[in-house]
């Protein structure tokens, strides 16, 4: 997980589809009691902005030590600062901890910029505003790094929400998600919903307001409009899915699928950006731009470096295209489609508004390790992280940011042939020379 | 080369509008790489920038002048203009137009300036 | 807003000597900066631009380096026509409307 754009840290709807419509799915009944529902005491339990991570509540060891723990589904480590760090408020002192159990191993995680490195144990661990359950699961106590804590960010650990098969060091330290699911009757699922604020929090804002939430074991009703559609989990290391089309403002890119999940795609919460692989990056800024056409703006603003400004209250968003990417469904030759907003693909930036300004960066970048669907695709939707059925939903936000003539959404079913054909498959690689970071 | 001049009346009378023509020559205006911007200069003080303009008419100003300033593109002649409405003896300066190049971020051609007084 | 802050406010160099112009950014602005000459009566030049990019025609005893909040224009050795005043501008935040208060260089 790596910081800045990898962190460990957010109807006008054109387009034709695919080919003929099919009938509309309705949602699917609950396929188990307690999945589906009211989980009140979940909701709102996530703080934090998609530049800096969103973070939960947790507490570790006997008597409980209080942390904010960064949420990450693009990694697998729960992993928590345990030594003074000038970017720490307060750490994980296993001195203090009377059910703290050394495993006696250290464990080491380079980044494309940056790492962190630390000593394997055990210790007991809770959500407090999550189910009411107390699990002993690994901890990578974290001693020394680099470029990983972020300032002001006021979270002090990491929860790899993915699967063990990118555990570092190696696949048999079982992540928490898959502890929590064994000790306990959690149903094996979780949902996330990360509202972005639309404008810049200063720090006390961003510990005054909420983030959204973590529903931990089923889906919450209240925290999403309209259905469900679900995407497969191509592989458990990742939450691996597949992109079958993409358009800006409804105009299909026209590359080969293959393209979009090169060298695979993934939803990352760690992850700011939306971050595309180079050809179908730099297609869709030519998309953007074409579609943006009545301004121009500097080269920088469209790498993510410069920052845009308007007058307060006067950003354009009718200038700015949607973006849909459409997603395998679980029927065969069935896809469906979610679009995001500029509201969620330009970022606001706090460090330099005024009340004068609202300044933005483009969140969309360039990725040499596949599609990355970040915080900025991740705030348009409710996504459900259906780990018992291998699948991944979407549903559109209650809290998404909008305005007054455009809406994210998750729209389909649409006829898309072939898609298994969009799937690159990784050439085998001794283990030790992939690169944890995504930069 | 590229060339930019600035041409309008030296003395506008106070609550007047100062109003400014920048000609350029030697390249089109129309070229999509740049923007074209206004910067003043009040006498023995630093720059000010005013705002700019694209060929296509998307306009950019500074807030604290936006209320009264217009700039405006003509591409046929090749010529770009700016007006400021209700000026004060503050307006004073030097006015120059210039070239936003280099991503469309710096001032790397300017004009030679031109200095508009506002006095009755 | 982001302030540029410009030292010292007049430099007193003969020809031949070390000239180091500061500017300091009240807050980061990456790479994004520009500096500026203008002689009396004149319209400003691009000398700098991305802190440390030489624009056309500028000679290399020009030079610019920083990035972050803290960025400095290095003139090796003044020549008689680099007496000046120089402005720094970011342009981290666009529109390109922040300059610096300048720094006159002058002869000793």
């Known amino acids: 997980t790596q910081h800045g754009i990898r962190l460990p840290l957010r109807s006008g709807l054109g387009g034709a589809p695919l080919g003929l419509r099919l009938p509309r799915e309705t949602d699917e009944e609950p396929e188990e009691p307690g999945r589906r529902g009211s989980f009140v005491e979940m909701v709102d339990n996530l703080r934090g902005k998609s530049g800096q991570g969103y973070y939960v509540e947790m507490t570790v060891g006997s008597p409980p030590q209080t942390l904010n723990i960064l949420v990450d589904t693009g990694s697998s480590n729960f992993a928590v600062g345990a030594a003074p760090h000038p970017f720490l408020h307060r750490y994980y002192q296993r001195q203090l901890s009377s059910t703290y159990r050394d495993l006696r191993k250290g464990v080491y995680v380079p980044y494309t910029q940056g790492k962190w490195e630390g000593e394997l144990g055990t210790d007991l661990v809770s959500i407090p505003h999550g189910p009411n359950v107390t699990v002993r699961a690994n901890i990578a106590a974290i001693t020394e790094s680099d470029k990983f804590f972020i300032n002001g960010s006021n979270w002090e650990g990491i929860l790899g929400l993915a699967y063990a098969e990118i555990a570092r060091p190696d696949d048999s330290l079982e992540p928490f998600f898959d502890s929590l699911v064994k000790q306990t009757h959690v149903p094996n699922l979780f949902s996330l919903q990360l509202c972005g604020a639309g404008f810049p929090l200063n720090q006390s804002e961003v510990l005054a307001s909420v983030g959204g939430s973590m529903i931990i074991g089923g889906i919450d009703h209240s925290l999403y409009t309209g259905s469900l559609w679900y995407t497969p989990i191509r592989r458990e290391w990742y939450y691996e899915v597949i992109i079958v089309r993409v358009e800006i403002n409804g105009q299909d890119l026209k590359m080969d699928c293959k393209e979009y999940n090169y060298d695979k795609s993934i939803v990352d919460s760690g992850t700011t950006n939306l971050r595309l692989p180079k050809k179908v990056f730099e297609a869709a800024v030519k998309s953007i731009k074409a579609a943006s056409s009545t301004e121009k703006f500097p080269d920088g603003f469209w790498l993510g470096e410069q920052l845009v400004c308007w007058q307060a209250g006067t950003t354009p968003w009718n200038i700015f295209p949607v973006i849909s990417l459409y997603l395998m469904g679980e029927v065969t030759n069935q896809s469906f489609r979610i679009t995001i907003l500029p509201q969620q693909y330009l970022r606001p930036v706090e460090d330099v508004a005024t009340s004068q300004d609202d300044c933005y960066k483009f969140a969309i970048s360039q990725s040499s390790t596949g599609t990355v669907m970040g915080a900025v695709i991740m705030e348009g939707f409710y996504v459900v992280f259906d780990r018992a059925r291998k699948r991944i939903g979407f549903a559109v936000s209650a809290c998404h940011v909008h305005d007054e003539f455009r809406t994210a959404a998750v729209e389909g079913p649409f006829v898309t042939l072939d898609m298994e054909d969009c799937g690159y498959n990784i050439p085998q690689t001794d283990e030790s020379t992939l690169m944890t970071g995504r930069a | 080369q590229l060339q930019l001049q600035e041409s309008g009346p030296g003395l506008v009378k106070p609550s007047e509008t100062l109003s400014l023509t920048c000609t350029v020559s030697g390249g089109s205006i129309s070229r999509g790489s740049y923007y074209w911007g206004w910067i003043r200069q009040p006498p023995g003080k630093g720059l000010e920038w005013i705002g700019m303009?694209?060929?296509?008419?998307?306009?950019w100003y500074n807030p604290s002048l936006k209320s009264r300033v217009t700039i405006s593109v003509d591409t046929s002649k090749n010529q770009f203009s700016l007006k400021l409405s209700s000026v004060t003896a503050a307006d004073t300066a030097v006015y120059y137009c210039?070239?936003?190049?280099?991503?469309?971020?710096?001032?790397?051609?300017w004009g030679r300036g031109t200095l508009v007084t506002v006095s009755s | 807003e982001i302030v540029l802050t410009q030292s010292p406010a007049t430099l007193s160099l003969s020809p031949g000597e070390r000239a180091t112009l500061s500017c300091r950014a009240s807050?980061?602005?990456?790479?994004?900066l520009a500096w500026y000459q203008q002689k009396p009566g004149q319209a400003p030049r691009l000398l700098i631009y991305d802190a440390s990019k030489r624009a056309t025609g500028i000679p290399a005893r020009f030079s610019g380096s920083g990035s972050g909040t803290d960025f400095t224009l290095t003139i090796s050795s003044l020549e008689p026509e680099d007496f000046a005043v120089y402005y720094c501008q970011q342009v981290y935040t666009w529109p390109p409307r922040t300059f610096g208060g300048g720094t006159k260089v002058e002869i000793k």
């Open positions: 303009i694209y060929y296509s008419g998307s306009t």
């Open positions: 807050q980061s602005v990456s790479s994004y």
């Open positions: 210039a070239r936003v190049g280099h991503g469309i971020s710096y001032f790397d051609l």
